[in-house]
C-alpha cells in the first residue's frame, strides 16, 4: 500500500495506490483512491507512467480528457467515471501488454488540495493449473497443465502422505511456447503415483503462485485449485 | 443530446478520391475517438480507421496507403479521405463513436454517406 | 486478423419465439464483443456491448453472453419490430472486425 500527500503548497489530500499484476491479453486495474470531493467537476485525474512522455489517462471537470494521452494507449483506458465522486481514481486497462509494466502515478487535484502516489505494475501471465489421472500412462501417473505462464515459472510437486519429499526424480516438466510467441503452456508428469494420497502441483514466477490440488482414493478423485498474486502491496 | 452528422458527395469516379466530413455534438473530440465503418451493398461492416482524442490515428491495413483521418477539435469536426477509388469502394460510410474510452462498442453513428463510384 | 463467424445466415421466427444468434471468433477477444440491429435503410444499433452489458435504451428481452471466442445474442421473446440484420463485431485488438451478419425474418 502506497500512501502519498501533496508536497506542494498548504493543502495536501491523501492518495492511495495498491501495487498489482496484469495478466497479458486481458484487462486489468490500477488501483486509486483518493479523499473525495462534494463536486465532480473540482476533481482532477492524471494517470502518469515513469518514462512515458504522454498522458496515460486525464479526467477533468466531468469527463475524460485524451488529448495528451500517449500512443500506447490510444483506447485502451478508462476510468470508473461513476465512482470518482466518491473517491474512486482506479484505471481499467485494456488488453494488458508487457510492456505496460513500469511504475505509475496516480496525481489528484480536488478543492482540498493535491495529492500523488505512486504504483508498480509488473505484467505477466498466469493461469489456473489442472490437475488430472493419465489413464494413457504405463504406471499411476498424474498430469499437471495450465495453459498461460510468463515469464517461465517453477514448478514443484508436493504430498500429503510424504511432506518434505522431493518429487524432481520422479517428475517431467516441460513448456510449450503458444502462438502468441510470448506466454506458455506448463505441463509437469508426476510418476510412481500412490492411491490414497493428495498431491499438489505448484507453479510460481515472480507475479503468481498457482497451486492445483488432486486426492486420490480408490473409490473418488477430487480436484481442487488456487491462484495468488504474489505483489500486491499498497502504497 | 449526442450526435454526428456526416456530409460528402454521393457520385465518385473511378481512381478519384473521396472526401467526408463528420461533426459531431454533446460530446468533445478531446474524449473520444471517433470510428469509420463501410457497409458495400449486401455485405457485412467493415471497420476502416479511428481517429483518436490525441490525434493519433490507426488505420486497417487493408486501407492504410490510401486513408487519410484528421480532425479538427475546435470546430468539433472529423475529415475522411480515401484516394484512389474503384467500384468495388461502393458503399456506405459511417463515421461512429465508442460508447467508452476503452472501445467496448459503437454507441453513436452518423446517418451515413453512401458512395457510388461510377464513371 | 481476426475473423467474426455469425450463424445462421438467416432465420425466419414467429413472434414469441425465442431467438439464439451465434457469433464466433477465430481467436481469444475476451469480451469485446458487441451486438448492432440495423434495420433497412439504417444506420446500425449499438445493442449490446462488452458482450453482455445491454446498452442504454434497449428492452430486456435482449441479452448477450459468452467470453473469449464463443458468444451468443438471445431475444427471449421475438416482436415484429425485431425483424432486422443483426452484427457481431470484435474491438479487441486492430483491425476491429465485424461479421457477415444475421439476417432475422418474422412469419
Known amino acids: 500500500l502506497i500512501i502519498g500527500f501533496g508536497i506542494s503548497g498548504r493543502h495536501s489530500i491523501t492518495v492511495t495506490t495498491v501495487a498489482s499484476a496484469g495478466n497479458i491479453g486481458e484487462d486489468g486495474i490500477l488501483s486509486c483512491t483518493f479523499e473525495p470531493d462534494i463536486k465532480l467537476s473540482d476533481i482532477v485525474i492524471q494517470w502518469l507512467k515513469e518514462g512515458v512522455l504522454g498522458l496515460v489517462h486525464e479526467f477533468k471537470e466531468g469527463k475524460d480528457e485524451l488529448s495528451e494521452q500517449d500512443e500506447m494507449f490510444r483506447g485502451r483506458t478508462a476510468v470508473f467515471a461513476d465512482q470518482v465522486i466518491v473517491g474512486n481514481a482506479s484505471l481499467r486497462l485494456k488488453n494488458v501488454q508487457l510492456t505496460d509494466a513500469g511504475t505509475y502515478k496516480c496525481y489528484i487535484i480536488t478543492s482540498k488540495g493535491k495529492g500523488n502516489a505512486n504504483l508498480e505494475y509488473k505484467t505477466g501471465a498466469f493461469s489456473m493449473p489442472e490437475v488430472n489421472v493419465d489413464y494413457n500412462a504405463s504406471s499411476e501417473t498424474l498430469r499437471c497443465e495450465a495453459p498461460r505462464w510468463f515469464p517461465q515459472p517453477t514448478v514443484v510437486w508436493a504430498s500429503q502422505v510424504d511432506q518434505g519429499a522431493n518429487f524432481s526424480e520422479v517428475s517431467n516438466t516441460s513448456f510449450e511456447l503458444n502462438s502468441e510467441n510470448v506466454t506458455m503452456k506448463v505441463v509437469s508428469v508426476l510418476y510412481n503415483v500412490t492411491i490414497n494420497n493428495t498431491y499438489s502441483c505448484m507453479i510460481e514466477n515472480d507475479i503468481a503462485k498457482a497451486t492445483g490440488d488432486i486426492k486420490v482414493t480408490e473409490s473418488e478423485i477430487k480436484r481442487r485449485s488456487h491462484l495468488q498474486l504474489l505483489n500486491s502491496k499498497a502504497s | 443530446q449526442i450526435q454526428l452528422q456526416q456530409s460528402g458527395p454521393g457520385l465518385v469516379q473511378p481512381s478519384q478520391s473521396l472526401s467526408i466530413t463528420c461533426t459531431v455534438s454533446g460530446f468533445s473530440l478531446t474524449s473520444y475517438g471517433v470510428q469509420w465503418v463501410r457497409q458495400s451493398p449486401g455485405k457485412g461492416l467493415e471497420w476502416l480507421g479511428v481517429?483518436?482524442?490525441?490525434?493519433?490515428?490507426d488505420y486497417n491495413a487493408a486501407f492504410i496507403s490510401r486513408l487519410t483521418i484528421t480532425k479538427d477539435n475546435s470546430k468539433s469536426q472529423i475529415f475522411f479521405k480515401m484516394n484512389s477509388l474503384q467500384a468495388d469502394d461502393t458503399a456506405i460510410y459511417y463515421c461512429?463513436?465508442?460508447?467508452?474510452?476503452?472501445?467496448?462498442?459503437?454507441?453513436?453513428w452518423g446517418q451515413g454517406t453512401l458512395v457510388t463510384v461510377s464513371a | 486478423n481476426i475473423v467474426m463467424t455469425q450463424s445462421p445466415k438467416s432465420m425466419s421466427m414467429s413472434v414469441g419465439e425465442r431467438v439464439t444468434l451465434s457469433c464466433k471468433a477465430s481467436e481469444n477477444v475476451g469480451t469485446y464483443v458487441s451486438w448492432y440491429q440495423q434495420k433497412p435503410e439504417q444506420s446500425p444499433k449499438l445493442l449490446i456491448y462488452?458482450?453482455?452489458n445491454r446498452y442504454t435504451g434497449v428492452p430486456d428481452r435482449f441479452t448477450g453472453s459468452g467470453s473469449a471466442t464463443d458468444f451468443t445474442l438471445t431475444i427471449s421473446s421475438v416482436q415484429a419490430e425485431d425483424l432486422a440484420d443483426y452484427h457481431c463485431g470484435q474491438t479487441y485488438s486492430y483491425p476491429f472486425t465485424f461479421g457477415s451478419g444475421t439476417k432475422l425474418e418474422i412469419k
Open positions: 462488452g458482450a453482455s
Open positions: 461512429a463513436r465508442d460508447i467508452t474510452t476503452i472501445v467496448e462498442g459503437f454507441a453513436y
Open positions: 481517429i483518436w482524442s490525441s490525434g493519433n490515428t
